[in-house]
Every structure is written in C-alpha cells, then in structure tokens.
C-alpha cells in the first residue's frame, strides 16, 4: 500500500504564439482545481475508462479575476498535493490523466458551473520511494508543470511497496537473511507470509510458508527457548535443529560481501568469493575499466591509481553517481526549511513555503496573529512570538483548515470508498453509482437519476468520473 503524490507547480500559457485567453474575467471570476486519474501499466486507454489505480481531486484554488487587456498569466493554484492512495503493489509503470477544471463563480442559476479547461495524459515508469519526478505537459495553448512520486505507507517498503518492515527482534541486527529496511535502519525487512502461527518475534521466513528461528529459539513455530547445554561446538549446527544457543554474531553474519559475493569464515575473520567482474576484500571493486565506457552523460573516465578504483567518473555539472548515471537533484540537499517544498528548476533552486513561512529557503517564520486568520471560525492565540489557532469543533490543524476525519461518519453511500481530502472528503463510487456521496444510481440506459440541479453537484462535476 502507498500513496501517489502529485504537486502542480504552474498552469498557464505555453511558450510560442497564440496565447490563450484568460479563463476568468471581471464579469466571470473563477478558480481552478485539478483531477488526476491513474491506471496501471502503459496502456493507452480512453479518458473515460476506470481509474483502476485511483483518482483524486485537488482543493479549489484562489479566486482569480482577469485584469482587462492583460495576457493570461500563470493562474493561481490550489494549495497542497493531490494524493491518490493505492491499496496493493505499486505497478512501476502507469498511465495518468491530469485535468484542469475551471469553476465559474458568477451568478449562475443553481450555483457554480464547472468546465474542463485542459487535459493532459502520459505513460511513465516510476519506482516507489524514489525522488520527485518533474514533468511539463502541453494541452493546446496551455502548459502544465508538475512533479510526482509514489511512496509506500509503513510497513510497506521497496520499489513496489511489496516488502514489509517490522521492528528489529534483536537490538543489534536483523535476523538471518533479513536486511535492514533503508531508510528505517532500526527496522528489518519482514517476509510476506510465513507459516501460520510462526512467532513474529522469534521466527522469520525467506520462502512463503516456512518458519525459521532466530538465535535462541526453536520449535516448529519458533516459540520454544533453546537450552544452552547441548552445544556440539562453539559455532555448531543451527539453533533451529539442535536446540543449541549459538554464541554472538559470526564474521559472515549479515554477509559482508557485496555484489553477490559469498562469504566463508576463516580462523581470523572472513573471506569473500567474488563473482566475475568484482574483486576486493568485500567484492566492492568492479573489474570494469575505462575501456568499457562506464561513464554516462558525458562523464570523463579516469583510470584509478590503484586496483581499488579501476576507474573514476568525473561527472559534468548536473550529474552524479559513481557512473554519472544520476541527475543531480539538488533538492536532495534538503535546502528548504519549515516543511517547504523544494523545486530544482535546473538554473536555480526554489522553495515553495508553507503558510506562515517566507524567505528563499522558507527560513522566516511569519507566525503571529497580525494579519493572520484561523479558518473555519478558529481564533488566533499568540504566545512567545508564535501563534496557534484554537479551532472550532470539527476542525483541526495549524490553521483550522483540516476537518476532523470527515470519513469517520462513513458518508459514502452504496459501498463508495471515502478519502479524507483537503476540501473535505471525496467519495470513490462503486460501479453503478455517482454523485458527491455516491447517492445517485446510474440507470442502465446511461441516463442518470440526478435531479435538475442538486446542491453542490452538476452533471458535469468531475467527481462523477471517480
């Protein structure tokens, strides 16, 4: 399980001639919001096909009114990320549709009207847990700039969110065959499905259905503490078979040999048998030389001065890694303070600051009650140069903008799935139902049972695609 996150950076006229007219006017002020639809794989499905990986709506952006005679600028955007939770494995390859919607705020009968301004689509490969990927897409004369990533929700880890992590059983290291869960170094990778009843504290498995015991435990489910009296030798057979308590970690525990090397103990330490192409004490040295052209992206290969570094790639600006294979993401330097969102624009770093913070690195705290509002009826309380909001019932968060779990009351009808959302909640309806709360059945002939203008929903509302 995990979350796909989409951050919209800008939406405005693309380069070149034929700038689009502003979607809003003094007579018709409007605001933008976005919808993202995700599908697994690289299939080019129709926009209307189900968003099998999930979908999300953004909050509404600030109200915008065109200045007469001015060209359409980048339009003001909603705050926050669009988040699409996924329940199963992250597929690695996916298709996306991002729609930009306009909400007109004039005096229409029946409330605001929605219309689709632009739709972009694409197919991408993406590993979960990786850095933000940046993208620019054009739709007609409009240009959308955005970043996206997929991250796993604990205890899942890995590029597909299929590995699980659990707290370490032993204080110093993980059990045999289990690796630390980077970056959660205090947790260990946990196998997916062990034999039923296998002790979660003292057992583990490398194949589904097995139950292997950690040192000091034995029995078919690793629930029996071993006796210490029947040891055959100082490092005799495994505790799982003999009931013998094995002494502390041996030099090969955790396999110090890199790159697929196999470890064997020696009287003083250990020895690695390295696969072809690697050597060194821990098989950490690659046998590749500059003749093999190992440097990517224009990196300059220099032969190492000794066998330990058969070559070194001197990377051109903008690239890093032992083979210059990685584009430098300067956001990896963590330059933004106070939860600011980092954007590496190539020519410069930018930090998009959270409300209440300012400065090129979001280092300045603007927090005091002067000129500061707590949303939804909250009141601002000053103290020590900072501020906090005392929120009205049903709201929480720093500025009282967050509803207190809007899904708790199970508001989505007919088996719809509820997602807590910046602007309240969003219902993902079961097949055959639609509406803000999935309250309207869709007739088999395609006509909907919508009333003429239900409050807060129109037939064109993008929620009907969720």
């Amino acid at each position: 399980a995990g979350v796909f996150e989409l951050q919209i950076h800008s939406f405005g006229p693309g380069p070149g001639p034929g700038a689009p007219r502003s979607p809003c006017s003094a007579r018709l002020p409007c605001r933008l919001f976005f919808r993202v639809c995700l599908k697994p794989g690289l299939s080019e499905e129709a926009a209307e096909s189900p968003c099998a990986l999930g979908a999300a709506l953004s909050a509404r952006g600030p109200v915008y009114t065109e200045q007469p005679g001015a060209p359409a600028p980048d339009l003001p955007l909603p705050d926050g990320l669009l988040q699409v939770p996924f329940r199963d494995a992250w597929p690695g390859t996916f298709s996306f549709i991002i729609e930009t919607w306009r909400e007109e705020l004039g005096d229409q009968i029946g409330g605001p009207a929605w219309s689709l301004l632009a739709r972009v689509a694409g197919r991408r490969r993406l590993a979960a847990g990786g850095p933000w990927a940046r993208d620019i897409q054009r739709a007609g004369a409009w240009e959308l700039r955005f970043s996206y990533r997929a991250r796993c929700e604990p205890p899942a880890v890995g590029t597909a969110c299929t590995r699980l992590c659990r707290p370490r059983s032993a204080p110093s290291r993980c059990g045999p065959g289990l690796r630390p869960c980077a970056p959660l170094e205090d947790e260990c990778e946990a196998p997916l499905v062990c034999r039923a009843g296998c002790s979660p504290e003292h057992g583990f498995c490398e194949q589904p259905g097995e139950c292997r015991c950690l040192e000091g435990w034995t029995g078919p489910l690793c629930t029996v503490p071993v006796s210490t009296s029947s040891c055959l030798s100082p490092r005799g057979p495994s505790s799982a078979t003999t009931g013998c308590l094995v002494p502390g970690p041996g030099p090969c525990d955790g396999n110090p040999c890199a790159n697929g090397g196999s470890c064997s103990e020696t009287p003083r330490s250990f020895e690695c048998t390295c696969p072809r192409g690697f050597y060194g004490l821990r098989c950490e040295v690659s046998g590749v030389t500059c003749a093999d052209g190992p440097c990517f992206n224009g990196g300059l290969c220099v032969g190492g001065a000794d066998p330990d570094s058969a070559y070194i790639c001197h990377c051109p600006p903008g690239f890093q890694g032992s083979n210059c294979e990685k584009r430098v993401d300067r956001c990896s330097l963590q330059p933004c303070r106070n939860g600011g969102l980092c954007l590496d624009l190539g020519h410069a770093l930018r930090c998009r600051c959270r409300a209440g913070f300012a400065g090129p690195r979001c280092e300045h705290d603007l927090d005091d009650c002067a000129g500061r509002a707590c949303a939804n009826g909250g009141t601002c309380v000053e103290g020590g140069g900072a501020h906090r909001c005392s929120c009205a019932l049903g709201f929480g968060g720093r500025d009282c903008r967050e509803r207190a779990d809007p899904c708790a009351a199970r508001p989505c009808a007919h088996g719809g799935r509820c997602y807590a959302h910046f602007s309240g909640l969003v219902c993902a309806c079961a097949p055959g139902y639609m509406g803000a709360r999935c309250e309207f059945p869709v007739h088999p002939d395609g006509a909907s049972a919508l009333p003429a203008a239900p409050p807060g929903l129109r037939p064109g509302d993008p929620q009907r695609y969720l």
């Epitope: 850095p131 890093q320 990896s332 330097l333 963590q334 280092e363």
Partner: antibody
Framework: QIQLVQSGPELKKPGETVKISCKAS????????MHWVKQAPGKGLKWMGW????????GYADDFKGRFAFSLETSASTAYLQINNLKNEDTATYFC??????????WGQGTSVTVSS | DIQMTQTTSSLSASLGDRVTISCRAS??????LNWYQQKPDGTVKLLIY???HLHSGVPSRFSGSGSGTDYSLTISNLELEDIATYFC?????????FGGGTKLEIK
C-alpha cells in the same frame, strides 16, 4: 542547543577500514542534510559530499567516489563516514556539518584519522 | 568545478584594526558565498552566509559583502578571539568548493 558530536581519533594501518560517527542533537535530524569535509594536515577544507537524512541517499564529490561511504542510523540521529582500504593520504581530520539551505551552519569537532604502517 | 581563490594566505593586524579578507570565484556564484572561521584548536564555525547575512551568535563586528565573483569579509574592530583561519566557500554549484584560507595573526 544544536550539537554535532563526532567519535574519537583513530589510528589505522593501510588497507584497514575506519568508520566515523557524527551524533546530532538539538534539532530534527531528518530535516537537514549532513555533509562531510576533509582537512589534511596543514591544508584547507575539502567538501566530500552529503547524505540526505530523509531518504538515506548519498552524493559524493568526484575525489571521494569508491572507497568512501556515507550512511545513517536515523533512530540514533547519527551519520557515519566509512573509509575502506585506507591509504596514507587519508590521514586527515574529518568533519561532519549540517546544511541549512545556505551554508553548513553547525560543525562537529572533527575526528582525526591517522593512517600509518 | 568552481575555483575559489583567497589571494592572501596570511595576514597580520593589530587589535582594534579593521581587517578585510577577500575571496574570488572562477565564475559568478550568485551571492551563494559563505565564510567560516577555524580556530587554532580546529573547531569550525559559520560566520556569514549568503554573502552578507550574519549567522546567529556571531558578533556584529563581522560583516560580508560582494557580488558576482568578488567577495569580502570584514572585521571592523579586531579582537584577540578573532585569531583564526578564515575560509570562503561557494554553495552555488556542486561540488561545493572552499578557498585556501587566510590565517589571521596579531602583530
């Protein structure tokens, strides 16, 4: 207050491995990247690279690729520098330093590594 | 890589003097220039970041200026505790690079 406390001096032989620790306190460890700087005896400062404390991803300057490895123990708010297959020219003081978005604003006291046969 | 040059490797001055240490970059570094002080015991402290901003806890007698490729650190009223080596460092482009240092001594 913010502090970076490094492990003590090390005396090693060529070919051995050393692992230096840098324990941070007084701030949220995963909010700031950690950087490593080398100073050979009587010489200036040389930036070695950094590690992203949120993701664990390191970045190395060209001269420190191969035998050098940055790592973390996030639960202990500690960053590590490991140097494998030590050489005489690795004799230096190694500093860890926190990066605040503009500069390395707090530094460890330095760890002296002497490589001698 | 961007080269940082501190032309003066050592400097003697009297207590109370106004001292200026200069630093030049091999290309425009857009004000991403920092100054560090290394005391004789080896401890390193940030003095000035982003050309002219004083780090917290640093006495106001320290100031920084410059733009483009040329930058300087000024100590307006030299005190005994300022005896140290001063390094400039550019943070505009990876890899970050330091100047060779300027050692400040008392006459």
């Amino acid at each position: 207050q913010i502090q970076l406390v490094q492990s003590g001096p090390e005396l090693k032989k060529p070919g051995e491995t050393v692992k230096i620790s840098c324990k941070a306190s007084g701030y949220t460890f995963t909010d700031y990247s950690m950087h490593w700087v080398k100073q050979a005896p009587g010489k200036g400062l040389k930036w070695m690279g950094w590690i992203n404390t949120e993701t664990g991803e390191p970045g190395y300057a060209d001269d420190f690729k191969g035998r050098f490895a940055f790592s973390l123990e996030t639960s202990a708010s500690t960053a590590y520098l490991q140097i494998n297959n030590l050489k005489n020219e690795d004799t230096a003081t190694y500093f860890c330093a926190r990066y605040d978005g503009y500069a390395m604003d707090y530094w460890g006291q330095g760890t002296s590594v002497t490589v001698s046969s | 890589d961007i080269q940082m040059t501190q032309t003066t490797s050592s400097l003697s001055a009297s207590l109370g003097d106004r001292v200026t240490i200069s630093c030049r970059a091999s290309q425009d570094i857009s004000n991403y220039l920092n100054w560090y002080q290394q005391k004789p015991d080896g401890t390193v402290k940030l003095l000035i970041y982003y050309t002219s901003h004083l780090h917290s806890g640093v006495p106001s007698r320290f100031s920084g200026s410059g733009s483009g490729t040329d930058y300087s650190l000024t100590i307006s009223n030299l005190e005994l505790e300022d005896i140290a080596t001063y390094f400039c460092q550019q943070g505009d482009m990876l890899p970050w690079t330091f100047g060779g240092g300027t050692k400040l001594e008392i006459k």
